[in-house]
């Protein structure tokens, strides 16, 4: 038996983090996003649940909806109608999948100071929203869309085809929600509130994933979800637009699919209203390297939507898949014809392009060996976007303004020099025409949210600076965080290293690799975090490293598309390369190296443990994918193609965790999964376990009954992190 080693942070009155701190969320931070209601007015929900109105210019603020009104219906969220006459209050939140939930809605009349009675909304509602003008309501109930011209009016039923687990109107099915739209809704109002566009998803032919939900009853329930795995039948999508002024006169009108898309299996990817009678739809071939953006116009004479061929713009990737994780969406100019869009330039870096007529004639707006990440707002004279250009760090985000009114356009970094040490990772929230905006800084220092003048970029006010958190961290020994790069051959890998307090390079420390590594992800980010790995470094003296290997995002397509059609190879190889480099640094105890990951990270950590290199003593996989055939079609096929003999079946088979079962013999492996995981099905871990048993390989396992992919219920989460901590400490011979 190896003697136990205890890490003792020396000579300091500050205390180390405890696991309890992490599990209690003691050191969580706050952000402040204004809910803009005009150019200079916004709403915000206060700590004590009052809804407060603010006018930046007059400095007025007052409560528009008291917490007692909120409490009277147990409301947790709200939404003001654009005409400001009504507020919906949301209560009985009941989570479904990642974004979707059902809720009960009440409408409050601000003038009368009472709830609207008569024709009350049904419950539970799957989605509800105001029109962009006035106070029309659209909502989805039992997979059908309904419309109310006013909150007190009777509802008008727009669709009748809705059926549980078969046909979804205005809300996505499981796979579209998770892998394509990343929203709980699939309906969009036109800017003037005249038209309502929506998607119908037909899941009638999709195979069902069924799993037990144990609950408290004598018999478990079975959860059934239409879930297309790789190569399976996919949802059939149709897009409709209905005139909400006269919904009973003319029914919903279908928007035609571009010919080059409709010729084989395809996806709808997004919808953007351009003007009151112009809409932009994006489509994607099932083989996701061709995307088509189609601009359609309302033809009053035909009472139809026309999408001329000369308004189709094709985006194609020759080295991988179209877009990043998703295909980017267009940001239209005020002429309602030209638009700005992020896609790969000739060097394979994602940059902003200006499209006036054809994609071929696109004008490149940004360029360089860095990537434009998101276009926030296009106004008459400015375009605001985020990128990782500044100082060449891919894991930073700064906000830039391009003055498009000027010729040539001039570029200014709005955030680069504001709080240089504290803030290197920003997002922003703009008022309608960017007269004002809020900046939300996520780190690396304590997060801070500030309000700015959109003309001068002057800071007007600090909205949230996390003073309480700053005070409570004063007596905590936090680890030191470094973000650096390492080179291997012609490749550069960025890594984040979390070093124990009083780190001494002349000593040896255990190393834990935390990995995600999924295509188009990024783990090495300049953000603030106090989480489980922070505790492991602070209290247990473990060095933590996160490495962004090939396949990760924002470093160009050569790096991103390296993993195309061969998942599970380079992601693992690059983690191993990094570990070898870390050993060369001289402060890592080679006998005590572990790896852990969740989801895609569980897949990579499993394959790394089974790499046969002898680098790892132990590792943990939480909710891992074990075969790409078990995962969702849209995701798996985007990166792997189809699991068919004439496409990529061979690599689908080669890249499973089960194929490497024998190689787990010389490592300590902890396998963890929630039994009610709707996303990465328990099947994945069941198959790993079966393969390990068949190979007579010993391993440890833990399941979490009725927990989903997040294993997020309080008790389960506590148990999970406590269990993983014990496992790691045992592996590293650290006493409890």
């Amino acid at each position: 038996l190896r003697p136990s080693r205890v890490y003792k942070p020396e000579g300091n009155t500050k205390r180390a983090l405890t696991l309890k701190d992490i599990l209690n969320g003691t050191f969580s931070y706050k952000t402040y996003f204004p809910n803009w209601i005009s150019e200079q007015e916004y709403l915000h929900q206060s700590e004590d649940d009052n809804i407060v109105f603010y006018n930046i210019e007059t400095r007025e603020s007052y409560i528009i909806l008291s917490n007692s009104t909120m409490k009277s219906v147990n409301a947790t969220d709200y939404g003001l109608s654009p005409d400001r006459q009504f507020v919906y209050l949301e209560s009985d939140y009941s989570k479904l999948w990642r974004y979707s939930y059902t809720a009960t809605y009440y409408i409050y009349d601000l003038q009368n100071g009472e709830f609207v009675r008569g024709y009350e909304l049904p419950r539970p509602i799957q989605y509800l929203c105001w029109s962009p003008v006035g106070s029309k309501l659209a909502y989805v109930y039992q997979n059908n869309i309904y419309l109310k011209q006013r909150p007190g009016d009777p509802p008008f039923q727009i669709t009748y085809t809705g059926r549980e687990n078969r046909i979804f109107n205005g809300i996505p099915d499981w796979v579209y929600e998770e892998e394509m739209l990343a929203t709980k809704y699939a309906l969009w109002w036109s800017p003037d509130g005249k038209f309502l566009a929506y998607v119908e998803f037909n899941d009638s032919d999709i195979p069902i994933i069924a799993y037990s939900y144990y609950g408290d009853g004598q018999y478990p329930r079975t959860i059934n979800i239409p879930y297309p795995k790789a190569g399976a039948k996919n949802p059939v999508v149709r897009v409709f637009i209905v005139d909400t002024t006269y919904p009973h006169h003319v029914g919903p009108m279908e928007v035609p699919v571009p010919e080059m898309i409709a010729s084989s299996d395809y996806y709808f990817s997004w919808l953007t209203w351009v003007s009151s009678e112009r809409v932009c739809l994006q489509w994607l071939k099932r083989v996701q390297n061709v995307s088509v953006l189609s601009i359609c116009d309302f033809r009053e004479d035909w009472h139809a939507w026309e999408c001329p061929k000369n308004q189709e713009h094709v985006e194609e990737s020759r080295t991988g898949w179209a877009g990043g994780f998703f295909v980017s969406t267009p940001a239209f100019s005020q002429d309602a014809t030209s638009y700005y869009k992020i896609f790969s330039d000739k060097d394979g870096y994602k940059h902003i392009h200006y499209i006036k007529d054809t994609v071929e004639n696109a004008i490149q707006i940004t360029s360089g060996k860095w990537e434009a990440i998101y276009i926030f707002r296009v106004t008459q004279d400015s375009l605001f976007y985020s990128s990782n250009e500044f100082e060449g760090y891919p894991g930073r985000r700064n906000i830039y303004r391009i003055s498009i009114g000027n010729s040539p356009p001039s570029k200014k970094c709005v955030t680069c020099h504001l709080r240089k040490e504290r803030c290197q990772y920003y997002t922003a929230s703009f008022s309608y025409k960017a007269k004002y905006y809020a900046l939300v800084c996520y780190g690396p220092g304590l997060p801070i949210s500030t309000l700015h003048d959109g003309r001068t970029d002057q800071e007007i006010q600090v909205l949230e600076e996390n003073k309480e958190l700053e005070n409570s961290l004063r007596n905590i020994q936090l680890p030191k965080v470094e973000i650096k790069k390492l080179k291997d051959g012609g490749l550069t890998f960025w890594y984040k290293m979390i070093l124990p307090p009083q780190f001494d390079r002349s000593k040896k420390y255990p190393l834990l690799i935390q990995v995600y590594g999924g295509p188009c992800s990024q783990s090495v980010k300049s953000v603030f975090a106090v989480n489980w790995i922070t505790y492991l470094a602070s209290k247990e003296g473990i060095v933590i490293a996160l490495v962004d290997g090939r396949g990760t995002a924002f470093q160009g397509d050569k790096f991103l598309h390296a993993v195309y059609r061969k998942l599970g190879v380079y992601e693992v190889e690059d983690q191993l390369t990094a570990v070898r480099k870390f050993i060369e640094m001289g402060f890592i105890d080679e006998e005590r190296i572990a790896i852990w990951g969740w989801s895609y990270g569980g897949y990579v950590s499993s394959l790394a443990l089974a790499s046969g290199t002898g680098l790892f003593k132990c590792g943990i996989a939480v909710a891992p994918v074990s075969s790409w055939e078990y995962y969702a079609s849209i995701y798996s096929e985007r990166f792997m193609g189809l699991p068919t003999k004439d496409d990529n079946l061979e690599h689908y088979k080669n890249s499973t965790v089960m194929a490497r079962a024998e190689y787990f013999r010389n490592v300590d492996y902890l396998l963890i999964h929630g039994t009610a995981d709707d996303n990465v099905h328990f099947q994945n871990s069941a198959q790993i376990a079966k393969a390990l048993v068949n190979a007579q390989v010993d391993f440890q396992a833990m399941w979490y009954s009725d927990q989903n992919h997040g294993i997020s219920s309080g008790r389960s989460q506590n148990h999970l992190y406590t269990h993983m901590t014990h496992f790691l400490k045992q592996c590293f011979s650290l006493s409890d």
Epitope: S38, E57, R84, G113
Partner: nanobody, 116 residues
């Protein structure tokens, strides 16, 4: 001291037109979302129309949409309501309000009477 002075009301035939004005003082008019509201005899306050501070966006009650137009001149600190195709149910005292949201606080107003 905040002051809102409405004018332009009067007696008009069904189908006729009127233009109401509201002159503001004592506050930075150009920074405020402004509204017109009305009170018919024996009824509560009813919202009519609103306009953004920069005049860019306007909202109307269903009962007046297409007939009334709200506008503003920030240089003159004045809010307007152009009322066309007037109906007898438009008879009310009309007030302008600087409250960004209901409930509205109103002053003296201007009487509009639509007779058939």
């Amino acid at each position: 001291d905040v002051q809102l002075v409405e004018s332009g009301g009067g007696l008009v035939q069904v189908g006729g037109s009127l233009r109401l004005s509201c002159v503001a003082s004592g506050f930075t008019f150009s920074s405020y979302y402004m509204s017109w509201v009305r009170q018919a005899p024996g009824k509560g306050l009813e919202w009519v129309a609103s306009i953004y501070a920069d005049g860019d966006m306007t909202y109307y009650a269903d009962s007046v949409r297409g007939r009334f137009t709200i506008s503003r001149d920030n240089a003159k600190n004045t809010l307007y309501l152009q009322m066309n195709s007037l109906k007898s149910e438009d008879t009310a005292v009309y007030y302008c309000a600087k409250d960004p949201l209901p409930p509205y606080h109103v002053n003296q107003g201007t009487q509009v009477t639509v007779s058939s």
